[in-house]
């Protein structure tokens, strides 16, 4: 059962794994939310009946009934972990915190002209986990000023103390705002020789880099497979360090293989959710429970549904026996991953993907693309939306595309002449034009945010957010699309396809069924020589074949330019101007998305 | 844990010059200032200067111009140089951690006699 | 350069006592004023740093208090491992300088 609000005054009893400390119980909820076992927690407040060394405590919890009972004590605040919920988590956490000097180990000392600026440095220091910035209040001058970087083996302060004139906060790594590179490649054949901080055991490399990417100290790592040599290494996944933030020698080596935390694109690709199956693999651990299940998929729904569980192995029925049905052990562990993975005993295992919903829901898997042709077919562009305006008469304006349960990303040349945002309709999870009717349901508009440097779109700045008067359930034909990662500015993308319902040649009218084009990236030199006219900026991106033919239209604007990398969807343009349609040696013109991320973020973001 | 070690020549002769070394663990010199204080045997401390985490020096004016603090990050050791010792120079000499202009964590110190 | 003046070198006291040391800086050094103990052949030790706070396993008898130029160390019922010097320092402004000290003994 979900239960999301703190109980004040109240401390649960018994139950200990273990003490941080945390600015807030909010956090402290957080922080229990993300750690392999804890299901409950204390945190103190500070207060003038507690003793100060326990101000900021977090004590995370488990039991097996999954609640503890409960006892009065002044500033202590309780509460239940996010484990037990459904919704969408996230580990975000931009609140200064007044006053409070959150301790761990310095490593960098200096001087910023805000706390903004100390955040910001802390967010693309890949070491930083949070920081303390001393106001130009502060009572020693010298110190004014002065940004400390810190770090700690946790992730969290080792101590947390009341300091007048110091602010401190956390890296916004997870809030997706972190310009430190994204390196998604793992290396074959490759051992990192640097010092380990954690080992755990892990299936294969891709689990491997994902519980690097949320272990805080991780930066990269180093996978033994399980043809590895020796036996006793093998599926182990050693987690690493160094003080450049870069493997220092990498040794040549069969069966392992390496590679990086996906710190700062994990709000693009999946790093808790584990969904693979492994065959004729067991996964040992303490045991949880045995249950019957039909099929492995059954097992891993089981576990998922079973809040302790982090785990389970399943065992296929003999014959005939037990209605078909085979044996689902569900298992945990003190830090989520098996204790040991042995092969060849005919199992099936794998995790439980309750953990998922701490990944975006951009990440997921959508139905395989239907290849060849022009006609999309339903949810094969979930993100897509079309935008109605209902004046004077109700028509197709403009293409959007889903970037949050509440926000639709577009170009912001489509509201020239909108008065209002009341006149506008958003339908998601359309596919024909002529499903929409008097009664479909749509949704309404609270709010229209055009860039406030936007003059037209040639000029760039083509982008805009509508914030919706509801949320968007998310489910098979409507759900977001992911934003590139800052980190992802080199990445060159191939497999690009610009949608919408706008004219398949100048002169023609809004197309009934969604279309669909692949159209290959231009590089902004290229672009420029096409259009000399105009000033092709980096914050503009351009697609289209040489010789014409395929291109966005009229009414395909704000749109998204899609592109697949690594599995996921990236929305990489929004479609902006271009001079015609299709035509040759004329590339259409996109907003380019990854250089909007903060202005995206700070608007949707904003308390 | 935390600890800083000075180690110096113990003797040094009048108008020589003194080199002594704060060897440090548990923490980054990147990340905290280090400061050199003195203590002349029987009297009170004295403030000598100290450099910060980003390398910037502060002296204590009456002695600026026979001193130089510099460090080795990657070595996590501090230097203080001083020249042209007399005899009232003879004192103990500490380093010792910043921590928002106060001293959290000393050295043990090591003796410096200026004698001929 | 800034002066901090600690106006008795030597305090007498009994285990049990009250105690208040006085430190005076020659100008406003705000709140950044830190106190520290010396034991004969020990380091100081950090007790009170930015006039009130008290360092890490520090006993809650001894605080600091003051603001400016004028202020106040107080040990509230001394014990026998109180008997030290003990030193007052402008943490406010480079160079940062040090009181005279204070002896406290056994009366």
């Known amino acids: 059962e979900c239960v999301t609000q703190l109980l004040k005054d109240t401390c649960f009893e018994g139950g200990d794994i273990t003490t941080v400390f945390t600015p807030s119980a909010k956090y402290c909820q957080v922080v229990c939310t993300y750690h392999p076992r804890c299901l409950l927690f204390t945190f103190t407040a500070e207060s003038p009946s507690e003793d100060p060394t326990r101000w900021f405590t977090c004590v995370l919890k488990d039991s097996v009934t999954e609640t503890l009972p409960r006892v009065n004590r002044t500033a202590a605040i309780s509460g239940y972990s996010f484990k037990q919920c459904s919704h969408q988590i996230s580990a975000c956490n931009k609140d200064i915190y007044v006053d409070l000097d959150m301790k761990g180990i310095n490593y960098n000392s200096s001087v910023a002209k805000s706390a903004q600026e100390c955040q910001e440095r802390c967010t693309d220091d890949v070491h930083c986990h949070f920081f303390t910035y001393a106001t130009r209040q502060f009572p020693s001058l010298e110190h004014r000023n002065i940004c400390l970087l810190k770090h700690t083996q946790t992730g969290t302060p080792t101590r947390i103390t009341k300091l007048d004139k110091v602010v401190s906060g956390f890296s916004l790594k997870s809030c997706a705002l972190s310009n430190l590179a994204c390196i998604r490649d793992i290396f074959p054949n490759t051992v990192f020789a640097d010092s380990n901080i954690d080992s755990v055991m892990a299936p294969d490399a891709f689990v491997c880099g994902r519980i690097c990417t949320h272990h805080p100290g991780c930066l990269f790592f180093t996978f033994f497979s399980q043809e590895w040599p020796k036996e006793s290494q093998r599926n182990l996944c050693l987690l690493k360090t160094s003080e450049s933030g870069l493997p220092s020698t990498r040794i040549k080596k069969s069966k392992a293989l390496s590679g990086f935390s996906l710190q700062s694109c994990r709000h693009s690709i999946p790093v808790f959710c584990h969904s693979s199956f492994y065959h004729d693999t067991d996964f040992l651990g303490e045991e949880l429970d045995i249950v019957a299940a039909k099929s492995h998929e059954a097992c891993q729904k089981l576990c998922t549904n079973a809040v302790r569980c982090q785990f389970f192995t399943y065992t296929p029925a003999q014959a005939s026996c037990n209605e078909g049905k085979g044996k689902c052990y569900l298992k945990l562990s003190s830090n989520g991953s098996p204790t040991k993975i042995l092969h060849g005993r005919g199992g099936i295992s794998g995790y439980t993907l309750r953990l998922c919903k701490m990944d975006n829901e951009c990440t997921t898997k959508i139905k395989p693309r239907i290849v060849g042709g022009t006609a999309s077919v339903r949810g094969e562009w979930p993100w897509q939306v079309t935008l109605h305006t209902t004046s004077p008469t109700q028509r197709h304006l403009c293409g959007g595309s889903i970037i949050g349960n509440q926000w639709i990303l577009t170009a912001a040349h489509c509201f020239y002449g909108v008065e209002s945002p009341k006149i506008l309709r958003v339908y998601s999870g359309i596919l024909n034009q002529s499903e929409i009717k008097e009664d479909t349901s749509f949704f309404g508009v609270q709010e229209i945010i055009i860039h406030d440097q936007y003059k037209m779109a040639e000029s760039g700045y083509d982008i805009a957010l509508l914030k919706l008067e509801t949320t968007v359930n998310y489910t098979d034909s409507q759900r977001p699309i992911c934003l590139p990662s800052k980190g992802d500015r080199n990445v060159i993308y191939t497999d690009c396809w610009v949608t919408g319902w706008g004219y398949r040649k100048l002169r023609d009218k809004i197309q009934n069924t969604l279309q669909k084009a692949k159209i290959p990236l231009v590089t902004n030199e290229e672009c420029q020589k096409r259009y000399r006219g105009h000033k092709i900026t980096h914050k503009m991106i351009c697609a289209g074949y040489r010789e014409g033919g395929k291109d966005a239209c009229k009414g395909d604007s704000g749109g998204p330019l899609s592109c697949k990398h690594n599995e996921v969807w990236h929305l990489v343009g929004i479609t902006s101007w271009g001079e015609g349609c299709a035509q040759r040696e004329r590339p259409g013109v996109y907003t380019n998305v990854v250089e909007y991320v903060d202005w995206i973020l700070e608007k949707t973001q904003a308390v | 844990q935390v600890q800083l070690e000075e180690s110096g020549p113990g003797l040094v002769a009048p108008s020589q010059s003194l080199s002594i070394t704060c060897t440090v663990s548990?923490?980054?010199?990147?990340?905290?200032?280090i400061y050199w204080v003195r203590q002349p045997p029987g009297k009170g401390l004295e403030w000598l200067g100290m450099?910060?985490?980003?390398?910037?020096?502060d002296y204590n004016s009456a002695l600026k111009s026979r001193l130089s603090i510099s460090k080795d990050n990657s070595k996590s050791q501090v230097f203080l140089k001083m020249n042209s010792l007399q005899t009232d120079d003879t004192a103990r000499y500490y380093c010792?951690?910043?921590?928002?202009?106060?001293?959290?964590?000393w050295g043990q110190g090591t003796t410096l006699t200026v004698s001929s | 350069d800034i002066v901090m003046t600690q106006s008795h070198k030597f305090m007498s006291t009994s285990v049990g006592d009250r105690v208040s040391i006085t430190c005076k800086a020659s100008?406003?050094?705000?709140?950044?004023v830190a106190w520290y103990q010396q034991k004969p052949g020990q380091s100081p030790k950090l007790l009170i740093y930015?006039?009130?706070y008290r360092n890490t396993g520090v006993p809650d008898r001894f605080t600091g208090s003051g603001s400016g130029t004028d202020f106040t160390f107080t040990i509230s019922s001394v014990q026998a491992e109180d008997l030290a010097v003990y030193y007052c320092?402008?943490?406010?402004?480079?160079?940062?300088?040090f009181g005279g000290g204070t002896k406290l003994e056994r009366l």
């Open positions: 100008q406003d050094v705000s709140t950044a």
């Open positions: 010792a951690r910043d921590y928002y202009g106060s001293k959290d964590y």
């Open positions: 320092q402008q943490h406010y402004k480079t160079p940062y300088s």
């Open positions: 548990g923490f980054s010199l990147t990340g905290y200032g």
């Open positions: 450099i910060w985490g980003d390398g910037r020096t």
């Open positions: 930015l006039t009130s």
